[in-house]
């Protein structure tokens, strides 16, 4: 039975040209996290595997940085980065847990400041 829950940063906004940290946290389970996949819509951005560490997708390697922790840092944001992001926790023996984050990338003067996990 899957007892765990995923906490995420929820809906966040950031400035065009800036950076943002996407962060998820799995709690309420003793299941072992074997791998975390980060996806944007249908595209895989990065993998963090317990044995091998990070793999950043070739098409994102210049704009995505691993961490902190199991999180992911998106850099040089553009308006096209607006959308849903998913952290997919592969665990044993529970199975798969998925968290959702919605990122809105705004023009510099419009972006809200102080969003949790946002890099100034």
């Amino acid at each position: 039975m899957m007892t765990g829950t995923i906490e995420t940063t929820g809906n966040i906004s950031a400035e065009k040209g800036g950076s943002i940290i996407l962060q998820c946290h799995l709690s309420s389970t003793t299941a072992q996290v074997t791998q975390v996949n980060w996806e944007q819509q249908d595209q895989l951005l990065a993998i963090c595997n317990a044995d091998l560490g990070w793999h950043i997708s070739p098409s994102f390697k210049d704009r995505v940085a691993p961490g902190p922790g199991l999180g992911l840092t998106l850099q040089s944001l553009t308006v096209n980065d607006t959308g849903e992001y998913f952290c997919i926790y592969h665990t044993y023996p529970d199975g798969t847990y998925t968290g959702r984050i919605f990122l809105e990338v705004l023009e510099s003067s419009v972006a809200e400041h102080g969003a949790r996990f946002q890099i100034p």
Epitope: T34, N37, D42, Q43, L44, D51, L52
Partner: antibody, heavy 120, light 107 residues
Framework: QVQLVQSGAEVKKPGASVKVSCKAS????????MSWVRQAPGQGLEWMGI????????SYAQKFQGRVTMTRDTSTSTVYMELSSLRSEDTAVYYC?????????????WGQGTTVTVSS | DIQMTQSPSSLSASVGDRVTITCRAS??????LNWYQQKPGKAPKLLIY???SLQSGVPSRFSGSGSGTDFTLTISSLQPEDFATYYC?????????FGGGTKVEIK
């Protein structure tokens, strides 16, 4: 040119161990992950595991956990795959193969294969 | 582990035919799928990576498509040297796994 040269055919008795080598040349050895794949006679391909030649980290398929050990020697640009407690079902051709980018990608360069026969 | 199911397991075709092989994953694997060609007694050869990217040196008659769970390898006009066995492989989640293979034979 880029190539992987594997050690020669082996005949082993059940319960014994075998160590297959794979020598890389023509590229920077530590920049590419290496996978091992086997193929039993008349059967399909079976992924065994992967090693990072740079740091030595490994990940093995559950089926082989506890029986397989993958290592590397950076001074000779060689990776090794040792399989212990051999049984007749381990009779197969064993291939090493270079991963083209990171660890989650296609295997673009393959060794010629090493035939391992397990027979009493 | 993610299961990869290929269909058909074998097919007969003639030179010049358009051939389609499908691969289905037991869960979504984004576009993290590779296709390989293997001829008897030889090591496999990478044809397609990332579901649709053609590996350097591979003829353009080979193409791949799909995302999520359903993928296709297409040979637009089968050539004599294309008679072989084709395998799909997912690299979305470790352990990476192969499909059972599709043998393309001469009709």
């Amino acid at each position: 040119q880029v190539q992987l040269v594997q050690s020669g055919a082996e005949v082993k008795k059940p319960g014994a161990s075998v160590k297959v080598s794979c020598k890389a040349s023509g590229y920077t050895f530590t920049s590419y992950y290496m996978s091992w794949v086997r193929q039993a006679p008349g059967q399909g391909l079976e992924w065994m595991g992967i090693i990072n030649p740079s740091g030595g980290s490994t990940s093995y398929a559950q089926k082989f956990q506890g029986r397989v050990t993958m290592t590397r020697d950076t001074s000779t640009s060689t990776v090794y795959m040792e399989l212990s407690s051999l049984r007749s079902e381990d009779t197969a051709v064993y291939y090493c193969a270079r991963v083209r980018y990171g660890y989650a990608d296609g295997m673009d360069v393959w060794g010629q294969g090493t035939t391992v026969t397990v027979s009493s | 582990d993610i299961q990869m199911t290929q269909s058909p397991s074998s097919l007969s075709a003639s030179v010049g035919d358009r051939v389609t092989i499908t691969c289905r994953a037991s869960q979504s694997i984004s576009s993290y799928l590779n296709w390989y060609q293997q001829k008897p007694g030889k090591a496999p050869k990478l044809l397609i990576y990332g579901a649709s990217s053609l590996q350097s040196g591979v003829p353009s008659r080979f193409s791949g498509s799909g995302s999520g769970t359903d993928f296709t390898l297409t040979i637009s006009s089968l050539q004599p040297e294309d008679f072989a066995t084709y395998y799909c492989q997912q690299v979305y989640h470790l352990p990476f796994t192969f499909g059972g293979g599709t043998k393309v034979e001469i009709k």
